[in-house]
Interface confidence: medium
């Protein structure tokens, strides 16, 4: 299954100047004095996708991008020949680099940037309602960005911003060295990983974090980080990146004596994303590069797919893996990685694991702890001494849903759309990559429903040169993809029906669950119109079963794939 | 429906100065680069001066230094200052908005031209 | 002198198909795309082929660009006598900091 669909050719290849003859792409193609649009907000209630570049914030329409307002906030000369004046370039360094951008409450945004080596947060006034039409920094009011926003603009920040607090993954000193997960804002003492000390954190890159829900007690609340990272001496043989999740509960306030202002319930995991070699050897995609969180009915159990790259150059390979947070609290529940000294490999802790367990939020449901900063000290020791788990989190099925391979490009972002069609739902997945394309994937179950099939549906460029797609949006209100990158931000549409062709046959074959044959057209599938007068069929695409003799009006023969 | 209306021009000394007006409708100014292309009579098309929606501007060599373009986005108004004209100067000038959203990079909107006659 | 050049003119009868050609070098036809433009007589020029080889809506199928190397041409099939006008190419020259060259611009009569 992932083997067959390992390097399956795209039903429809689209140029980027196909794309745009058919009306199919949108481009901002950025403006000269500004670059890096890679920080993403997508807000579906304003109808506005906020995007943080080099020196300025913009606010699209998500209707039409070509509709946009922008704030320009450059850094002062004086902070730029500081900047200049430390050894760092001019145009690709010394300037602010928006980094944050998260919402503050209805009427505000938060904003970080690099601010050229010397990290600067505000405030930017949104309104109350989409028709306030307002967007204008609070230039009145700036903060220190240390420990918010990195310094150097190669670096990423993981950011969250949930009741006035903001949760920030990033480098926190000039040299970005000093890596930590940080709270910062709000009416508490700023709280962080612990400092100098590899087994919390070992040079670690960034990628997104989210809140997930424990139980229906607000209390025990968690926030999940997703990393990756050099992993730990003894835990690997030679240098080598480990993918990461790392949780904190939300009501860590630190401890009393010992991890004063630092997490006290900080636990990470390995994530494992690999396939069986011929030699015995799994190949593993440990670089990850993004991941995106597809909400479920129960909001504690939304579905992880992350996106990963291979360490190797000589084989340059990507995945996506699917994880489930059943397995990832299963591992957090599990034995703890212990090792008696630098020498010694990691074994499973088989000692007495102190009471209230490390890593669980201090509630009402799991016990009598009111807070952290009332914890055992045996716990404290525990924790500052045993942040990683012994156990991976494997993927759902034990194996990628899907790799790619012998191919000149890698996978960079993922967004995910639940779509109902005719026979079930289906997540479409779409890809970026770092050559400028977008891939549209959907997962088929083939035999049993946990026996997922790939299927490239398409492979659209969306930028006129190659360029790293660094951001992707998906407003399932407005139907639209939207895509940040170096040179711009793209938009296009999350189907193109009409370009399956002419007949019913060639729209069943396209097996796109947006897409349904009408009777006289290929359009978008809508699961209240009538059933008997649309034809789809996404597990199968048989058209024989499917397309009425009327439907298929003897045109079976001319059925094609585009390439 | 796009509209570009060009005003401004007429006939002045060597030497002289003059402001061109480009009034746009019909489309969100502000989202896009904006050009003057000039044509001197019974000659082809040359580009003159553009700037960007970010502001930023560009001129060719041979009006650098004299020529500067601006816009004002509240008036949906581009502008072209020209000084120390030449006679060399004397054209049809055209405003004209460039789609470089959809990376067609093109000039898809055209006004009617507006002529500068350079003479003594 | 323009930096793309172009032949001065080009005729034809109606029906007939028109070639007219636009050569340059590697820093703008060779790296960049080719526009198109029409000028009818005492008129604004018009978009007619953008991106080497696509028509703006409203534009007949009847013209249609190509481009090889670092040469572009526009042909004309059917050719009508509301077609008699100055047709120019255009494309943004690397070497001269990104900024648009046309051609010298090429006058097409229909005859008859």
């Known amino acids: 299954n992932y083997a067959n669909g390992k390097n399956n050719v795209p039903r429809l290849k689209l140029s980027y100047k196909e794309m745009l003859e058919s009306n199919n792409v949108i481009t901002f193609n950025g403006l000269a004095n500004s670059s890096s649009y890679h920080t993403f907000l997508l807000d579906e209630e304003r109808s506005r996708l906020y995007v943080g570049a080099k020196d300025h914030i913009f606010s699209f329409n998500l209707v039409n991008i070509k509709d946009f307002q922008k704030i320009v906030w450059p850094v002062s000369y004086t902070r730029r020949d500081e900047c200049k004046w430390a050894g760092k370039d001019i145009l690709k360094e010394c300037a602010n680099f928006i980094k944050v951008l998260e919402a503050y409450n209805q009427t505000h945004l938060y904003a970080c940037g690099t601010g050229a080596f010397h990290p600067i947060c505000t405030y930017i006034e949104v309104g109350h309602h989409p028709e306030d039409n307002i967007f204008k920094l609070q230039d009145s009011h700036f903060e220190n960005g240390r420990g918010k926003s990195p310094y150097d603009p190669k670096l990423l920040t993981a950011s969250l911003l949930i009741d006035g607090e903001l949760y920030s993954g990033t480098a926190a000193d000039f040299m970005g060295r000093d890596f930590a997960i940080f709270r910062t804002l709000g009416h508490h003492h700023p709280i962080r990983t612990e400092q100098h000390d590899s087994r919390w954190l070992n040079d670690p890159r960034f990628i997104s974090a989210h809140l997930i829900p424990e139980s229906d007690n607000p209390e025990d609340d968690k926030v999940y980080f997703f990393f990756r990272e050099n992993a730990i001496d003894g835990e690997h043989s030679g240098k080598a990146t480990h993918a990461r999740i790392g949780q904190i509960c939300k009501n860590d306030f630190g401890g009393h004596r010992s991890l004063v202002n630092k997490w006290t319930t900080f636990l990470k995991a390995r994530l494992i994303c690999s396939v069986p070699g011929p030699n015995g050897i799994d190949t593993h995609f440990d670089e990850l590069q993004d991941v995106f969180l597809m909400n479920s009915k129960d909001p504690k159990n939304p579905i992880v797919y992350g996106v990963f790259t291979t360490s190797s150059n000589i084989f340059k390979g990507s995945a996506v893996c699917m994880y489930s947070m059943s397995d990832v609290r299963r591992v957090f529940l599990g034995p703890y990685a212990h090792r008696d000294g630098p020498n010694y490999q990691w074994v499973p802790y088989q000692g007495r694991v102190p009471y209230p367990r490390p890593g669980t939020c201090p509630s009402k449901t799991f016990g009598g702890f009111d807070s952290t900063k009332d914890l055992p000290d045996d716990v404290i020791t525990f924790a500052r001494s045993h942040p990683a788990m012994y156990n991976p989190v494997f993927p759902i099925n034990n194996r990628p849903i899907m790799i790619k391979t012998d191919v000149n490009y890698q996978f960079t972002q993922i967004v995910v759309d639940r779509v109902d069609a005719e026979d079930g739902q289906y997540d479409v997945m779409f890809i970026g990559t770092d050559v400028g394309t977008v891939l549209k994937v959907v997962s088929v179950p083939k035999e049993t429903w946990h026996d997922l099939e790939e299927i490239l549906l398409e492979e659209m460029t969306v930028f006129r040169e190659p360029t790293t797609i660094s951001a992707m949006e998906l407003s399932t209100k407005q139907q639209q993809l939207y895509i940040g990158s170096t040179a711009g931000v793209a938009q296009l549409p999350l189907h193109r029906c009409d370009i399956y062709g002419k007949a019913c046959a060639e729209c069943c074959l396209a097996r796109d669950p947006y897409c349904a044959w009408d009777g006289s057209s290929c359009s978008r599938y809508f699961p209240t119109a009538k059933a008997r007068t649309r034809a789809q069929d996404i597990r199968n695409g048989d058209p024989l079963t499917h397309c009425s003799d009327g439907g298929i009006e003897g045109r079976m023969d001319h059925h094609h794939h585009h390439h | 429906e796009v509209q570009l209306l060009e005003s401004g021009g007429g006939l002045v000394q060597p030497g002289g100065s003059l402001r061109l007006s480009c009034a746009a409708s019909?489309?969100?100014?502000?989202?896009?680069?904006m050009s003057w292309v000039r044509q001197a009579p019974g000659k082809g098309l040359e580009w003159v001066s553009a700037?960007?929606?970010?502001?930023?501007?560009y001129y060719a060599d041979s009006v650098k230094g004299r020529f500067t373009i601006s816009r004002d986005n509240s008036k949906n108004t581009l502008y072209l200052q020209m000084n120390s004209l030449r006679a060399e100067d004397t054209a049809v000038y055209y405003c004209?908005?460039?789609?470089?959203?959809?990376?067609?990079?093109?000039?898809?909107?055209w006004g009617q031209g507006t002529l500068v006659t350079v003479s003594s | 002198q323009s930096v793309l050049t172009q032949p001065p003119s080009a005729s034809g009868t109606p029906g007939q198909r028109v070639t007219i050609s636009c050569s340059g070098s590697?820093?703008?036809?060779?790296?960049?795309?080719v526009n198109w433009y029409q000028q009818l007589p005492g008129t604004a020029p018009k978009l007619l082929i953008y991106?080497?080889?696509l028509r703006p809506s409203g534009v007949p199928d009847r013209f249609s660009g190509s481009k090889s190397g670092t040469s572009a041409s526009l042909a004309i099939s059917g050719l009508q006598s509301e077609d008699e006008a100055d047709y120019y190419c255009?494309?943004?020259?690397?070497?001269?900091?990104?900024?648009?060259?046309f051609g010298g611009g090429t006058k097409l009569t229909v005859l008859g």
């Open positions: 004209a908005r460039r789609d470089d959203y959809t990376s067609r990079d093109a000039f898809d909107y």
């Open positions: 019909g489309f969100t100014f502000y989202s896009y680069a």
């Open positions: 700037i960007g929606y970010g502001g930023d501007t």
């Open positions: 590697s820093s703008n036809i060779g790296s960049n795309t």
């Open positions: 991106y080497d080889d």
């Open positions: 255009a494309a943004w020259d690397d070497s001269l900091n990104d900024i648009p060259v």
